[in-house]
Each structure stands twice: as structure tokens, then as C-alpha cells.
Interface confidence: low
């Protein structure tokens, strides 16, 4: 993989770890929320980004060509950023400056930018069209989205931890 398209694995690892923490802070499983332990319906299950075995995010896949996996992660981050920008999170008091939600939003953007290859045009992707959610549905949707994001980020963080440990190029001393 050309040097220019290789991410700064250590920085990605640090940012993704921070993102995991922020996602949990934004939605720590509270006791009363457990009463709402709704089963993931088919539509939710199929329409959220999941890093799967065919995405090349396993150690061997990363070694062979990390770009395939990194593209999945980039698109997952864009997907969730799109959801956080949607009306589902509008009017959410937690979106006040420096709140966990606001920090999560900023960090998602930061990691996305870090993963965007410099020599690569910005990828365009069709995002899910969101029907205006009813006020009463929003807390439940927010909960589902954040739990799904937590799972996605946990895997992404493992990918970056592996990359930082095994794929970081040693610094070559200059003469």
C-alpha cells in the first residue's frame, strides 16, 4: 500500500479509543433504559454499518490490503455522522457545546478526516433517507443508533490497535 494512502495508525488508535469512550458517555446503559430492551428489528439490523468477515478487517486482511477495511470504516463513520446530524438528535439538550454528544460528533469528523487519503477524491455515498421522526420515537431511535455506534466503534478501535502494533512503518533516520 503506498505510503500516502496509509493512515497514521497510532493517531487513529488514539482517536478511536477516545470515540469509544465518548459513545459510552453519550449513552451509558441506564437502569430505566433496560426496560426498553427492544429487540433489534430486521430493518435496523440490516441498515446499520457492521464490519463483517468479508470486509478485510481481520489481521491477515489488514496486512494484505488495509484500504478495503479502511474504506468500510470511513463509510461507517460517515453513516453515523449523517444520523447524528439528522432530526433524530435535533433539540437534544445533550448537543450543547462540550457535551458528550457534541464531542462525539466532532471526534467522528476528526477520525473521518484522518482516514481520508490525501490523493483521493472525497467519496460520495448515498445515505439513508430519514423520514421525519415523531417526537416520541426519538429517544428510542437515539438509543438504538448510539448502541449500534458503540459496537461499530469497538471493532474499529480493535482494527486501529492492530494496525498501530503491526503496520506502523518504522521511522527511517535521516542522514
Amino acid at each position: 500500500v503506498p505510503r500516502s494512502s496509509s493512515p497514521d495508525w497510532a493517531q487513529c488508535q488514539q482517536l478511536s479509543r477516545n470515540l469509544c469512550m465518548l459513545a459510552w458517555n453519550a449513552h451509558a446503559p441506564a437502569g430505566h433504559m433496560n426496560l426498553l430492551r427492544e429487540e433489534e428489528d430486521e430493518e435496523t439490523k440490516n441498515n446499520v454499518p457492521r464490519i463483517q468477515c468479508e470486509d478485510g478487517c481481520d489481521p491477515q486482511g489488514l496486512k494484505d490490503n488495509s484500504q478495503f477495511c479502511l474504506q468500510r470504516i470511513r463509510q461507517g463513520l460517515a453513516f453515523y455522522k449523517h444520523l447524528l446530524d439528522s432530526d433524530i438528535f435535533k433539540g437534544e439538550p445533550a448537543l450543547l457545546p462540550d457535551s458528550p454528544m457534541e464531542q462525539l460528533h466532532t471526534s467522528l469528523l476528526g477520525l473521518s478526516q484522518l482516514l481520508q487519503p490525501e490523493d483521493h477524491p472525497r467519496e460520495t455515498q448515498q445515505m439513508p433517507s430519514l423520514s421525519s421522526s415523531q417526537q416520541w420515537q426519538r429517544p428510542l431511535l437515539r438509543s438504538k443508533i448510539l448502541r449500534s455506534l458503540q459496537a461499530f466503534l469497538a471493532i474499529a478501535a480493535r482494527v486501529f490497535a492492530h494496525g498501530a502494533a503491526t503496520l506502523t512503518e518504522p521511522l527511517v533516520p535521516t542522514a
Epitope: 463483517q52 490490503n65 484500504q67 468500510r72 463509510q75 455515498q125
Partner: nanobody, 122 residues
């Protein structure tokens, strides 16, 4: 209507080569990945390789790594699977499939071709 049409299958001697094509039509596939799968009677469909339309990133199953190469021609809306050093165990029906990149649920490939038979004789 979306259509994926595979071609290029056939009978080949062990050690030989074949190139499969998958012509895609009916929609824009810019945000899709194209996967190659294979299936032998009585066995589950097995992932072989995948390529992303947007940047050409590829990924291969361990069993074909170093022997198979997938590529795409955006102008022709076609993806290819170049199979070299074929072995008898590569005998199967080969399918191409398309999957939205923003949805990663496995194996939710939205569209499938009808398949093309590849037979490798020893």
C-alpha cells in the same frame, strides 16, 4: 431492473486459467462493492473475492489469494475475476453479487447473477 450477468466459465485443465466477467446494468453501482462467490453441490456458498467500485480496493479469501485477481472497468460497468493456476477444488458455480457499501450486514448482497459453471479437470 438491476441485472448481473456472468460469463467466461467453462472446462479447463488443472494449472490453466479462466477469466470470468460480470456485466452490471440497471442502476449506478458507484457506492457498491461487487463480490465473487462460488458454490459446489451440497455445500454453502463461499466468498471468493470483492472489489469496491469507487476506488478499486480488493479483498480475497485465503484459498484463492495469489491465484485469483478481481478488477473492474467502470466505463463498461463490468467486473472481472482472473483465475490462474486453477485446481480441481476450484470447480464450482461462480456467482457475482452487488452489495451497498453503506450497509455491511452479511451476507446481504442485494443483487445476484445467475452463475457460471467452472470445471477444472485433473
Amino acid at each position: 431492473e438491476v441485472q448481473l450477468v456472468e460469463s467466461g466459465g467453462g472446462l479447463v485443465q488443472a494449472g490453466g486459467s479462466l477469466r470470468l466477467s460480470c456485466a452490471a446494468s440497471g442502476r449506478s453501482f458507484s457506492d457498491y462493492a461487487m463480490g465473487w462467490f462460488r458454490q459446489t453441490p451440497g455445500k454453502e456458498r463461499e466468498f471468493v473475492a470483492a472489489i469496491s467500485w469507487s476506488d478499486g480496493s480488493t479483498y480475497y479469501a485465503n484459498s484463492v489469494k495469489g491465484r485469483f485477481t478481481t478488477s473492474r472497468d467502470n466505463a463498461k460497468n463490468t467486473v472481472y475475476l482472473q483465475m490462474n493456476n486453477l485446481k480441481p477444488e476450484d470447480t464450482a458455480v461462480y456467482y457475482c453479487a452487488a452489495r451497498r457499501l453503506v450497509y455491511y450486514s452479511d451476507p446481504k448482497y442485494d443483487y445476484w447473477g445467475q452463475g457460471t459453471q467452472v470445471t477444472v479437470s485433473s
